[in-house]
């Protein structure tokens, strides 16, 4: 979780603070929402279990070519233990089943916002 | 208008069983969690469990695990608590109340109350 | 569990009078985020309790500025600085940060 501060982060970050940042990143996408998120570009929907992180910068780093979310991308690669590459999928996606970056966003934000305030943050 | 409204309350004999209704309008209940709080008659309040809507995460005082039943129906946009074996020190105002929907801090809205009393 | 313990369990004021009332956890309420989840409510009899201050130290929307809280660790207070007639009531604190959350006893504000 080191990098997740951001490359002026002075050392590592507490996994709290690493996905309260998170989650504040989700929230600044979700407010400054005009257009449609990345243009419309559907991704695949994840199960929000264990692993999660993972799965879910697996589905948006096939989303190309849209800024609004470089920064989330970089921030769940610090929650995910391997490697990510586009066209890699988990069998936590839910294969049948693709929904809007935007929807994709409200719904991990949702997540994301229940586990820190349950105290789960890895 | 964010609105929440219990119902089922009444009068039940020792060891029987009631289910209690928590119907919310004005929000989606799996945005937030629902939560129910007992007040004895001249009493002080007291936190009985909590569900997550979202995905059945639920959390109850061990002193009610085992009689007491926290459930939800998102289609309903509704919590429920099932109590059984009742006894008469159950008697209470029972109330749902929201986690405000931003980070869960608080209950910001509460409902009116359904009164349950257990006597022979 | 938690215990939350209140004092005084009931004062009488005067309008315009400062009333303060204690809560004291039995162990730390800081949460595993950093947060402490402690939380003062007013209650009218046969009404549901009313939000007054959240995270210790936070006034809720429509909270007039008279009521405050305050405090760290085990040790919380709430401050009505100026009491008026509608804030004769009954007052909770409670601790949302470990499972099973837990209310005070209540402290019973009663008009001198």
């Known amino acids: 979780l080191t990098c997740l501060g951001g490359f002026a982060s002075p050392g590592p970050v507490p996994p709290s603070t690493a996905l309260r940042e998170l989650i504040e990143e989700l929230v600044n996408i979700t407010q400054n929402q005009k257009a449609p998120l990345c243009n419309g570009s559907m991704v695949w929907s994840i199960n929000l279990t264990a692993g999660m992180y993972c799965a879910a910068l697996e589905s948006l780093i096939n989303v190309s070519g849209c800024s609004a979310i470089e920064k989330t991308q970089r921030m769940l690669s610090g929650f995910c233990p391997h490697k990510v590459s586009a066209g890699q999928f988990s069998s936590l996606h839910v294969r049948d089943t693709k929904i809007e970056v935007a929807q994709f966003v409200k719904d991990l934000l949702l997540h994301l916002k229940k586990l820190f305030r349950e105290g789960q943050f890895n | 208008e964010v609105q929440l409204v219990e119902s089922g309350g009444g009068l039940v004999q020792p060891g029987g069983s009631l289910r209690l209704s928590c119907a919310a309008s004005g929000f989606n209940i799996k945005d937030t969690y629902i939560h129910w709080v007992r007040q004895a008659p001249g009493k002080g309040l007291e936190w009985v469990a909590r569900i997550d809507p979202a995905n059945d995460n639920i959390k109850y005082d061990p002193k009610f695990q085992g009689r007491f039943t926290i459930s939800r129906d998102n289609a309903k946009n509704s919590a429920y608590l099932q109590m059984n074996s009742l006894r008469a020190e159950d008697t209470a105002v029972y109330y749902c109340?929201?986690?405000?929907?931003?980070?869960?801090?608080?209950?910001?809205?509460w409902g009116q109350g359904t009164l349950v009393t257990v006597s022979s | 569990d938690i215990q939350m313990t209140q004092s005084p369990s009931s004062l009488s004021a005067s309008v315009g009078d400062r009333v303060t009332i204690t809560c004291r956890s039995s162990q730390s309420i800081v949460h595993s985020n950093g947060n402490t989840y402690l939380e003062w409510y007013q209650q009218k009899p046969g009404k549901a309790p009313k939000l007054l201050i959240y995270?210790?130290?936070n006034r809720f929307s429509g909270v007039p500025s008279r009521f405050s809280g305050s405090g760290s660790g085990t040790d919380f207070t709430l401050t009505i600085s100026s009491l008026q007639p509608e804030d004769f009531a009954t007052y909770y604190c409670?601790?949302?940060?470990?499972?099973?959350?837990?209310f005070g006893g209540g402290t019973k504000v009663e008009i001198k």
């Open positions: 109340a929201r986690s405000e929907e931003n980070w869960y801090d608080f209950f910001d809205y």
């Open positions: 995270k210790v130290s």
């Open positions: 409670f601790q949302g940060s470990h499972i099973p959350y837990t």
